[in-house]
Interface confidence: low
């Protein structure tokens, strides 16, 4: 139904969805304190920028009694039931901030009208591709995609003389919520990676993990898997591995590799992280003492997200343009705003664009090194360390086929 | 109008810390970057290095290990330390206004620091 | 780093007259973060030009910014007395940021 906008006259307002189900199981405390420090930066640009005008943000909260699973499976009926008491109450702000999960968020997406503005941290699936006014503000699963069909087919380095063409996927179902949809991602059949890849299988169990690690047979020395170094380790343990087997770990929201007193474990020798590369941010910030690596990223999704309607709500105040406009509620992409750690584009379709860095362990060191940076703007990968320290054969990425080619 | 305004001692011993503070009016320093650069006479500009509200601060690589710059956003001020300095960092050294992707639109009028025994 | 290299060192025009000033990056400036910036004798740089091609904020019109890739140009179309000076260029497409050695513009 049609629900009026507080958005005009001066005053307006964000409406942040509250959500128990969640992507990261962040206390909702964090949250409100990351949307409460974005707003007092907004006040203060829009000040600076003689726009003497009322932001506040409206936390919408759901009764949590039915909901209450925490992780994302039970959140599609809570996104909905956030939209029905938005509309029972008939107020909603000039933006929506809030669903976090895939599912609620396509499904809120396809049952509300496209005159305002959907702003999300995380929505990671591919269900919420190029969706007209949704903005995803942390890496979705299609950016990840992009990158490993560019480095498959990457053979040009020195490091990299091959182009890969097949792969196994370990997903067993565990997974946080965007290690699930970066991993469905690989597995659909239809998408760019499978498309892209001559073979590509989908390992569901523990044992089938660990039997191609030495088997003879395998189809493909390169396997993908989303989660942390423990998570890996749980796995793996301190199995033989074939020389010739590369793990790539998908790890992006954890900057732990990144401290100075970090040494790589010895089951991480055959493994590539691939990471984003670290901001330093909220360090001194209240909201963020007592968070995890990859909480600081949700957080900050979300103060990011105050910024940029911020941002968008200057633009056009300054124009004299409307606010509850399905203009303004379209805008929200192909453009660069002052994040809280620094520029934060978005692409042609909302989705933020950002740097993604390839890290390998260095067998002299025991350090994470950078190996490679890949930026998701522009869909290209620049080589950082020209002579790797690998613990491949001659410091060379392997075949992906053992026997095809020399090794 | 924003405003930028250095202050600081204008000679400085070799091996000591040179130290600067810029103080913004006309506007808040928590919307914005904030940089340092410097000129030696009758050269050309040099980008120390800048800071952000966050505390996210971004160094010229060549000057990085001996930098820290702070920000104070309760007195609208920003800061420059730079340790162990010797005659070759003899300049007159600008603070300005960093539009978040890098380039400078405010700029202070500039102060010259002498590094001399 | 980017090396950005700026000719000519010293051009000698009269006022009315057209100048162009070029930038030469060592490699290419990403989405085109140029700016150029115009230094007087004892005053800091003013910024004239952003994202190679935006004016900034109060500056005449007939400044203009141009170029890509490695390749940038300052033009003043028609010169004014009160437009002899230094001009530099600044990337800030990769860190560090850096500047031009600067060109300066002289009355002939």
């Known amino acids: 139904s049609q629900v009026s906008q507080n958005c005009h006259n001066g005053s307006y307002e964000i409406s942040v969805l509250m959500m128990g189900n969640s992507a990261f199981a962040e206390p909702l405390k964090n949250l409100e304190d990351a949307v409460n420090e974005g707003l007092e930066i907004v006040r203060g640009r829009l000040q600076n920028a003689g726009l003497n005008v009322t932001v506040n943000a409206t936390f919408m909260y759901s009764d949590g009694l039915i909901h209450n699973s925490g992780d994302c499976r039970s959140s599609t009926c809570e996104g909905l039931d956030l939209l029905r008491k938005i509309s029972n109450a008939q107020r909603m702000g000039c933006v929506l901030i809030g669903p976090s999960c895939t599912y609620s968020t396509f499904q809120m997406y396809l049952d509300t009208e496209l005159s305002y503005p959907m702003i999300s941290a995380g929505s990671f699936g591919l269900s919420c591709d190029y969706k007209e006014t949704l903005t995803r503000l942390m890496s979705p699963a299609r950016k990840l995609m992009y990158f490993l069909v560019n480095f498959w087919k990457t053979n040009d380095l020195p490091f990299k003389t091959y182009s890969w063409s097949t792969s196994y996927v370990y997903k067993n179902g565990t997974e946080t919520e965007d290690c699930f949809w970066y991993l469905n991602a690989l597995e659909a059949s239809v998408s760019y990676f499978s498309h892209e890849l001559g073979f590509k299988v989908v390992l569901r169990q523990d044992k089938e993990f660990q039997d191609i690690l030495m088997d003879h047979n395998r189809k493909s020395n390169v396997i993908i898997m989303c989660g942390g170094p423990e998570f890996l380790y749980k796995l793996k343990g301190d199995r033989a591995v074939a020389e010739d087997i590369v793990i790539i770990l998908v790890d992006l929201f954890n900057d732990q590799y990144f401290e100075d007193n970090v040494t790589a474990p010895d089951y991480m020798k055959n493994v590539l992280v691939l990471t984003l590369s670290p901001g330093n941010s909220l360090l001194n910030s209240s909201f963020s003492r007592n968070l995890s690596p990859t909480k600081r990223d949700f957080a900050l999704a979300y103060l990011n997200g105050i910024l940029l309607f911020g941002h968008m709500l200057k633009i056009f105040l300054e124009n004299g343009e409307n606010i509850t406009t399905p203009k303004f509620a379209h805008a929200f992409r192909n453009l660069t705003f002052e994040g809280y750690d620094g520029p934060v584009t978005l692409d042609d379709w909302g989705d933020v664009d950002s740097t993604m860095v390839l890290l390998y362990t260095s067998v002299d060191t025991k350090k994470y090194k950078v190996l490679l940076t890949y930026d998701t703007h522009v869909n290209k990968t620049y080589p950082v360390d020209m002579s790797p320290t690998f613990t491949w054969k001659n410091s060379k990425l392997p075949n992906d086929i053992t026997g095809r080619g020399p090794q | 109008q924003v405003q930028l305004q250095e202050s600081g001692p204008g000679l400085v011993k070799p091996s000591e810390t040179l130290s600067l503070t810029c103080t913004v009016s006309?506007?808040?320093?928590?919307?914005?970057?904030w940089s340092w650069i410097r000129q030696p006479a009758g050269k050309g500009l040099e980008w120390i290095g800048r800071?952000?509200?966050?505390?996210?601060?971004t160094f010229n690589p060549s000057l990085k290990s001996r930098v820290t710059i702070s920000v104070d956003t309760s007195k609208n001020q920003f800061s420059l330390k730079l340790s162990s300095v010797t005659a070759a960092d003899t300049a007159v050294y600008f603070c300005?206004?960093?539009?978040?992707?890098?380039?400078?639109?405010?700029w202070g009028q500039g102060t010259l620091v002498t590094v001399s025994s | 780093e980017i090396v950005l290299t700026q000719s000519p060192g010293t051009l000698s025009l009269s006022p009315g007259e057209r100048a162009t000033l070029s930038c030469r990056a060592s490699?290419?400036?990403?989405?085109?973060?140029l700016a150029w910036y115009q230094q007087k004798p004892g005053q800091a740089p003013r910024l004239l030009i952003y994202?190679?091609?935006s004016r900034a904020t109060g500056i005449p019109d007939r400044f203009s910014g141009s170029g890509s890739g490695t390749d940038f140009t300052l033009t003043i179309s028609r010169l004014e007395p009160e437009d002899f000076a230094v001009y530099y260029c600044?990337?800030?497409?990769?860190?560090?940021?850096?500047f031009g050695q600067g060109t300066r513009l002289e009355i002939k």
């Open positions: 300005a206004r960093d539009r978040y992707y890098g380039y400078l639109d405010y």
């Open positions: 006309g506007g808040s320093i928590r919307s914005y970057y």
């Open positions: 800071i952000y509200i966050s505390g996210r601060t």
């Open positions: 490699q290419s400036v990403s989405r085109s973060y």
């Open positions: 994202d190679a091609s």
């Open positions: 600044q990337q800030y497409g990769s860190s560090p940021s850096t």
